[in-house]
């Protein structure tokens, strides 16, 4: 007989998920040399352990801590790139800007990005059918804890001057739902960071307006203000000709605005 | 992985000076925050200084224009620079490194004596 199964409204772990984080971890560790120590099969094991056989409701950041720990790394804090529905973007910035940093280009964030994971209460089986909705289920379940405490914890990480990009097409350019609104902007510490810069990505071609002067760009200046961080913000008008000039930047256009 | 070492403390009179360092395996100052920590007997530690790779500094109000903090990055060092000493001043002091995700790292202390 079947046993019954919860039925989740989101999609199910992605198939293939720890033969997918394993062969992650032991990519990442052969690319950046710094992590070679890391036992990869440890690895597994602690993200594992953070899911199975829990609610998928009931996850908590201390189901994480083993995993956070073998995912120790020294991530440089002032040249770390935040950034908010322009994921590609940023990485494709920081692929050619190799000393700066988004959470995905840490070994953890590496690990988990685009996947969805997650288990049964009083089962070692991964549920590969449907896992828990944020809005529709519920928000304690194992991606969105994760990803919650994971970027908590870079914006703590963060130091002196901190960048975000910020996509320019989007009706909310800051949205105070997103990550970056809720969790990483809150999670930056006066302390030891003395700026945040938004770079504001123009998605049209003939776009000069100005959205720095958006109104809610005027809210997330706001906000970091009343923290006591000061704030900036640049327009990238051409984000093509924006990473092309970092490649190149002694290109002789490089030196306009972009 | 990170290993910290504190050296330069001692005992010295109220008024006196100290200079504390903090060495680290590999250049870890050059990118990442560096906190230096006292604890007084019967304590917790308590964060007495920060500095950041930028060279930003806060310190703690019992610090503030008698301990300067600073780096070395040649030299993979920070120092606390400890001036206008009192008895309160007495306890051990740590340097600390915070790794992300939060991994924290700490010397074996270095011993600070006031004598009044």
């Known amino acids: 007989v079947p046993r019954w199964r919860q039925q989740w409204s989101g999609p199910g772990t992605t198939k293939r998920f720890p033969e997918t984080v394993l062969a992650r971890c032991v990519k990442y560790t052969e690319i950046h040399p710094e992590m070679r120590h890391v036992d990869c099969q440890s690895v597994w094991d602690a993200f594992k352990g953070a899911f199975i056989s829990k609610h998928p409701c009931n996850i908590t950041e201390e189901d994480y801590q083993p995993l956070m720990k073998l995912g120790t790394q020294t991530v440089p804090c002032n040249k770390i790139l935040l950034w908010s529905r322009i994921k590609d973007l940023a990485h494709q910035f920081t692929q050619v800007q190799r000393d700066m940093f988004t959470l995905e280009d840490t070994l953890l964030g590496y690990l988990a990005d685009d996947l969805t994971w997650c288990g049964e209460f009083n089962t070692s089986k991964i549920n590969y059918q449907s896992c828990p909705d944020w809005r529709k289920d519920c928000s304690n379940n194992p991606v969105s804890v994760f990803w919650k405490t994971v970027s908590r914890r870079f914006a703590e990480a963060a130091c002196d001057v901190v960048h975000v990009m910020l996509n320019g097409s989007r009706s909310k350019i800051f949205d105070k739902n997103s990550t970056f609104g809720s969790v990483e902007v809150h999670n930056l510490q006066p302390e030891k960071v003395q700026t945040l810069e938004a770079w504001v990505i123009h998605g049209g071609r003939e776009d000069s307006r100005d959205l720095c002067q958006d109104p809610t760009i005027k809210e997330l200046e706001s906000i970091i203000s009343k923290r006591n961080i000061q704030f900036s913000c640049k327009n990238i008008y051409r984000p093509d000709k924006f990473l092309q000039c970092v490649k190149n930047p002694e290109d002789s256009s490089c030196t306009s605005e972009i | 992985q990170v290993q910290l070492v504190e050296s330069g403390g001692g005992l010295v009179q109220a008024g006196g000076s100290l200079r504390l360092a903090c060495t680290a395996s590999g250049n870890i100052f050059a990118s990442q925050v560096m906190n230096w920590y006292r604890q007084a007997p019967g304590s917790p530690r308590e964060l007495v200084a920060t500095?950041?790779?930028?060279?930003?500094?806060t310190y703690a109000d019992s610090a503030k224009g008698r301990f300067t903090v600073a780096t070395d990055n040649a030299k993979a060092t920070a120092y606390l620079q400890l001036t206008s000493l009192t008895p309160e001043d007495t306890g051990v002091y740590y340097c600390?490194?915070?790794?992300?995700?939060?991994?924290?790292?700490w010397g074996q202390g270095t011993q600070v004596t006031v004598s009044s």
């Open positions: 500095i950041t790779p930028g060279g930003r500094t």
């Open positions: 600390h490194v915070r790794l992300f995700p939060a991994t924290d790292y």
